[in-house]
C-alpha cells in the first residue's frame, strides 16, 4: 500500500502530527494529488545533487500540469484553482533553488515513514500509549492463553490417569497377594492347575497393562514438562521481558506500562499446574514403592522428572519476583531512578505467583550494590548504606488488586564516608552521575518442602548528593534505558553505546509528552536534530554519542545540548505549560525556517520559540513588521528567562508587549499568533481579569487608586537590526518617571529596575497607567 494511503488510516493523534509536517512550503494538497509519483522519486539524491534536483523539479511541474488536465476533465473547479495556485507558488519559490524543495520533500517523506513506524510499534504493544491498562490481547497472547489452557487440561487428564493406574495397581496387588496366600503359585500339581494357570495369565496380563500405563504416564509427564517449559519460556523470556522493557520505557517518559495482573494470572496458573504435576510425580514414587518390577519405568524416569519439575517451579518463582515500581523520590515522580542522598524514596516489589498460602510469609530485605562490593572499591565508585525500614513482609492487603507485594515507602541512602571525600579511590573513571548502582531485594520461600531463594533488583539508579546534579543524572537514566535492556549493567558508562537519532528523537519527545499534554512535532525534532548533528536531509540512523548528547558543549556555546534542553523542559513545565499544551509555542524552529514561514505573513504575525543561546532556558517571540520603506522585517525580542517569568506570566507579557516608536508612541507589534490566531483569542484567557489586579483598594479613601499594569516595552533605536534581538525594558509608571528611588523593586536580574529618561539598555519590565 502506498505510504500516503497508510497514513490516512492512522489514529487522530498521528494525523495531528502529520498536519504539523506540512506547511505552505510544501502544501499537503500537492502531497495528496501526486502521492504515487512523489513516492516514486529519489528526493534524498535530488537534495544533494543540483542537476538531479532541477530535473525532478521540472518533472514535478509536468506532473502538476497532467493532474490539472484531469481536474479539468472532471470539472473540479476548486482543485483546479488550488493546483494552479500551488504551481505558481512553487515556481516563484523554488525555480532558482530546486534543491531546497527536494530537501523539504525528502524530509517530509522520511518523517512520514517514521510516523508509520511509531504507530506500528504502538499497535504491537497493544496501544498502551492510549490505554495503559486496557486488556488488548495480541495473537501471540491468545496463543499463550491456549497453551496454558492445554497445560491445565493435560494436568487434569493425568490426574484421571493416575487414579486409573492406581486402581489397576491395587487390583493387581490384590490378585497377586491372593494367589500367593492361597499357595496357588506353588501348588501347580493340584486339581485347579488350569484355573491357576488362567489366573496367572490374567495376572501377567494385568502387569503388562500396568507397565503400559506407567510408561504412558511417564511419557505424558515428560511431554507435559516440555509444554510447561515452552509456556514458561514464553512467559518469562517474552511476556515478562516485554513488560520489563516497557517499564524501562515508561520510566523515561514513554507510554505507560500495562498492568501486571494478566501476567500474574498466567504465571500463577502455570505455577499451580506445576505444583499439581509435582504431586503426581510424588504419587508415582508411592506407586513404585508398593509395586515394582524389572524394567519399571517409574524407577527409570521419576528422579529426572522430579528434578525437572522442581527446576521449572524454582525458576518460575525466581522470575516472578519483580520490581513493580522502580525506586523514585516522591518529589520527582517524573524522574525515577535518580535518588538524592538523605531524601526518601519509594519502591515496590511483587511476586507474580499469587498463592494465598504465601501471604505474610515472605520477608523482603533491601540492600544496595550487593554484588559489587570489591568491584565498586576497585572502580572508585561511592558506597552507600540504606537507611529506613529496609525489611518488609509481603502481603495481599496493601495493594488494591490483592497482589502479593511489598512497598517500601521510607528508604533513604547515606554515603559511606571514606578518607578521600567518599570516593573509594582517586582513580574513579566515572563522574558521579555516570555511576550506576543497583538496589537488591531478597527473600526466601519455603513451599511444599522446597526452599527457594528469591532475588530481584531495580534498574540501575544514579545517586546524587545535590539537586543540581539532577539534569546530568537524568540524562544518564535516559541514555541507559534508551539503549539497553540489560537490567544490571552497572559498567554501562565506562564505554557508553552510541544512539541513533531515531532513538534520541523519540526519547526527547517523551520528555515533553510525559509531563505535558504534547510531545514534539516532527518539525521541532528536526530542529533539534540540526542542533545535535548539523544541517542535513535525513537524520534517520545518524549516530549520536553520549558525549555529544550531554557532555560536550554545543558549537559556539558554553553548555551541552542536554543542559540546554533540560532547562527548556523545566521552563515549559513551570512557567508556560498551558501555552505549550495549547500548541501555541512553536518552540524549536531554526532561524531560516522561522524567516521562511513568517515572511509570507502579514505584519503583526508572531511565533513563540525557545532561545538557542540561553543556558538557563529562555522563551522569545519573533514577529513580522514592515519598515518605513515597506520592506518586511523579522524582529525577535530578547528571551525571557525563568527569573522574569517568575514575576509575570508569559501570556501577560505577550498581551502587554509594546514597542516605542520614534515618536515615543507605544504600539503593539504582536497581533496574530502564527498562522493567524488573534492574540486575544490565544492568550486572553491566561491573563488575570483587570478587576482582580488590585482587590485591596481602600474603600474609605476619597479617590480610588489609579490602576497600574506592568508591560514590557522595547524602544526602537537605529541599532536594532533584524539580526539582533530587541531588548525588552520596562517603562515605569508615568507617575514615577525619572524617580529612581521608588517604583518596582529591583530583582536579581534587574527585571524591574525603573527605566530612566535616557532608557538604559537593560532588560526590564515597566508599569504604566491603565
Amino acid at each position: 500500500m502506498a505510504q500516503w494511503n497508510q497514513l490516512q488510516q492512522l489514529d487522530t493523534r498521528y494525523l495531528e502530527q502529520l498536519h504539523q509536517l506540512y506547511s505552505d512550503s510544501f502544501p499537503m494538497e500537492l502531497r495528496q494529488f501526486l502521492a504515487p509519483w512523489i513516492e516514486s522519486q529519489d528526493w534524498a539524491y535530488a537534495a544533494s545533487k543540483e542537476s538531479h534536483a532541477t530535473l525532478v523539479f521540472h518533472n514535478l511541474l509536468g506532473e502538476i500540469d497532467q493532474q490539472y488536465s484531469r481536474f479539468l476533465q472532471e470539472s473540479n473547479v476548486l482543485y483546479q484553482h488550488n493546483l494552479r495556485r500551488i504551481k505558481q507558488f512553487l515556481q516563484s519559490r523554488y525555480l532558482e533553488k530546486p534543491m531546497e524543495i527536494a530537501r523539504i520533500v525528502a524530509r517530509c517523506l522520511w518523517e512520514e515513514s517514521r510516523l508509520l513506524q511509531t504507530a506500528a510499534t504502538a499497535a504491537q504493544q497493544g496501544g498502551q500509549a492510549n490505554h495503559p491498562t486496557a486488556a488488548v490481547v495480541t495473537e501471540k497472547q491468545q496463543m499463550l492463553e491456549q497453551h496454558l489452557q492445554d497445560v491445565r487440561k493435560r494436568v487434569q487428564d493425568l490426574e484421571q490417569k493416575m487414579k486409573v493406574v492406581e486402581n489397576l495397581q491395587d487390583d493387581f496387588d490384590f490378585n497377586y497377594k491372593t494367589l500367593k496366600s492361597q499357595g496357588d503359585m506353588q501348588d501347580l500339581n493340584g486339581n485347579n492347575q488350569s484355573v491357576t494357570r488362567q489366573k496367572m495369565q490374567q495376572l501377567e496380563q494385568m502387569l503388562t497393562a500396568l507397565d503400559q500405563m506407567r510408561r504412558s504416564i511417564v511419557s505424558e509427564l515428560a511431554g507435559l514438562l516440555s509444554a510447561m517449559e515452552y509456556v514458561q519460556k514464553t512467559l518469562t523470556d517474552e511476556e515478562l521481558a516485554d513488560w520489563k522493557r516497557r517499564q524501562q520505557i515508561a520510566c523515561i517518559g514513554g507510554p505507560p506500562n500495562i498492568c501486571l495482573d494478566r501476567l500474574e494470572n498466567w504465571i500463577t496458573s502455570l505455577a499451580e499446574s506445576q505444583l499439581q504435576t509435582r504431586q503426581q510425580i510424588k504419587k508415582l514414587e508411592e506407586l513404585q514403592q508398593k509395586v515394582s518390577y524389572k524394567g519399571d519405568p517409574i524407577v527409570q524416569h521419576r528422579p529426572m522428572l522430579e528434578e525437572r519439575i522442581v527446576e521449572l517451579f524454582r525458576n518460575l518463582m525466581k522470575s516472578a519476583f519483580v520490581v513493580e515500581r522502580q525506586p523514585c523520590m516522591p518529589m520527582h515522580p517524573d524522574r525515577p531512578l535518580v535518588i538524592k542522598t538523605g531524601v526518601q524514596f519509594t519502591t515496590k516489589v511483587r511476586l507474580l505467583v499469587k498463592f494465598p498460602e504465601l501471604n505474610y510469609q515472605l520477608k523482603i530485605k533491601v540492600c544496595i550494590d550487593k554484588d559489587s562490593g570489591d568491584v565498586a572499591a576497585l572502580r572508585g565508585s561511592r558506597k552507600f548504606n540504606i537507611l529506613g525500614t529496609n525489611t518488609k513482609v509481603m502481603n495481599m492487603e496493601e495493594s488494591n488488586n490483592g497482589s502479593l507485594s511489598a512497598e517500601f515507602k521510607h528508604l533513604t541512602l547515606r554515603e559511606q564516608r571514606c578518607g578521600n571525600g567518599g570516593r573509594a579511590n582517586c582513580d574513579a573513571s566515572l563522574i558521579v552521575t555516570e555511576e550506576l548502582h543497583l538496589i537488591t531485594f531478597e527473600t526466601e520461600v519455603y513451599h511444599q518442602g522446597l526452599k527457594i531463594d528469591l532475588e530481584t533488583h531495580s534498574l540501575p539508579v544514579v545517586v546524587i548528593s545535590n539537586i543540581c546534579q539532577m539534569p546530568n543524572a537524568w540524562a544518564s537514566i535516559l541514555w541507559y534505558n534508551m539503549l539497553t535492556n540489560n537490567p544490571k549493567n552497572v559498567n554501562f558508562f565506562t564505554k557508553p553505546p552510541i544512539g541513533t537519532w531515531d532513538q534520541v528523537a523519540e526519547v526527547l519527545s517523551w520528555q515533553f509528552s510525559s509531563t505535558t499534554k504534547r510531545g514534539l512535532s516532527i518539525e521541532q525534532l528536526t530542529t533539534l536534530a540540526e542542533k545535535l548533528l548539523g544541517p542535513g536531509v535525513n537524520y534517520s540512523g545518524c549516530q549520536i554519542t553520549w558525549a555529544k548528547f550531554c557532555k560536550e558543549n554545543m558549537a559556539g556555546k558554553g553548555f551541552s545540548f542536554w543542559v540546554w534542553l533540560d532547562n527548556i523542559i523545566d521552563l515549559v513545565k513551570k512557567y508556560i505549560l498551558a501555552l505549550w499544551n495549547e500548541g501555541y509555542i512553536m518552540g524549536f524552529i531554526s532561524k531560516e525556517r522561522e524567516r521562511a514561514i513568517l515572511s509570507t505573513k502579514p505584519p503583526g504575525t508572531f511565533l513563540l520559540r525557545f532561545s538557542e543561546s540561553s543556558k538557563e532556558g529562555g522563551v522569545t517571540f519573533t514577529w513580522v513588521e514592515k519598515d518605513i520603506s515597506g520592506k518586511t522585517q523579522i524582529q525577535s525580542v530578547e528571551p525571557y528567562t525563568k527569573q522574569q517569568l517568575n514575576n509575570m506570566s508569559f501570556a501577560e507579557i505577550i498581551m502587554g508587549y509594546k514597542i516605542m516608536d520614534a515618536t515615543n508612541i507605544l504600539v503593539s507589534p504582536l497581533v496574530y499568533l502564527y498562522p493567524d490566531i488573534p492574540k486575544e483569542e490565544a492568550f486572553g484567557k491566561y491573563c488575570r481579569p483587570e478587576s482582580q489586579e488590585h482587590p485591596e483598594a481602600d474603600p474609605g479613601s476619597a479617590a480610588p487608586y489609579l490602576k497600574t499594569k506592568f508591560i514590557c516595552v522595547t524602544p526602537t533605536t537605529c541599532s536594532n537590526t533584524i539580526d539582533l534581538p530587541m531588548s525588552p525594558r520596562t517603562l515605569d509608571s508615568l507617575m514615577q518617571f525619572g524617580n529612581n528611588g521608588e517604583g518596582a523593586e529591583p530583582s536579581a536580574g534587574g527585571q524591574f529596575e525603573s527605566l530612566t529618561f535616557d532608557m538604559e539598555l537593560t532588560s526590564e519590565c515597566a508599569t504604566s497607567p491603565m
Epitope: Q160, K161, V164, N167, D171, F174, N175, T178, A209, M213
Partner: nanobody, 126 residues
Framework: DVQLVESGGGSVQAGGSLRLSCVAS?????MGWFRQAPGKEREGVAA????????HYTDSVKGRFSISRDYVKNAVYLQMNTVKPEDAAMYYC??????????????????????WGQGTQVTVSS
C-alpha cells in the same frame, strides 16, 4: 469418561455360537454385559471383576456363556454358546470404576456410576 465400543453382534442359528467384543477407552475395575429384548427391561448377563478374576452370570446363561477380559487391550468378551431364541436382544457393554461387580451390579442394585456402550444387536433364527 469411559468410552465403550461393542462389536461382534449379528445373526446366529439357535444352538450356534457368537463372540461379542467390547473395548474400553481406559482401565476400569469392572466390566460386563447387559441385554434388552424388545418390550422388556434391561437385564444383566455377565460381569467380571478385576479382583479375583471371578465371573458372575445371570442364571439363564450359566454354563452356556463365558466372560473374559484382556487387560492389555482394555477389552471384555462374551462367548455365547448353545444360543437360544430367548437370547435375541440388544447387547450392551458396561463398565464401572469400582471392582465390586457381582450379582448386585447385574441386578442393577449396586451403587456407583456405570458407563454404557451403544449396543450390538444379536438375532437368533430357529
Amino acid at each position: 469418561d469411559v468410552q465403550l465400543v461393542e462389536s461382534g453382534g449379528g445373526s446366529v442359528q439357535a444352538g450356534g455360537s457368537l463372540r461379542l467384543s467390547c473395548v474400553a477407552s481406559t482401565y476400569t475395575g469392572c466390566m460386563g454385559w447387559f441385554r434388552q429384548a424388545p418390550g422388556k427391561e434391561r437385564e444383566g448377563v455377565a460381569a467380571l471383576s478385576s479382583r479375583g478374576f471371578a465371573g458372575h452370570y445371570t442364571d439363564s446363561v450359566k454354563g452356556r456363556f463365558s466372560i473374559s477380559r484382556d487387560y492389555v487391550k482394555n477389552a471384555v468378551y462374551l462367548q455365547m454358546n448353545t444360543v437360544k431364541p430367548e437370547d435375541a436382544a440388544m447387547y450392551y457393554c458396561a463398565a464401572r470404576e469400582g471392582w465390586e461387580c457381582g450379582e448386585t451390579w447385574l441386578d442393577r442394585t449396586a451403587g456407583g456410576h456405570t458407563y454404557w456402550g451403544q449396543g450390538t444387536q444379536v438375532t437368533v433364527s430357529s
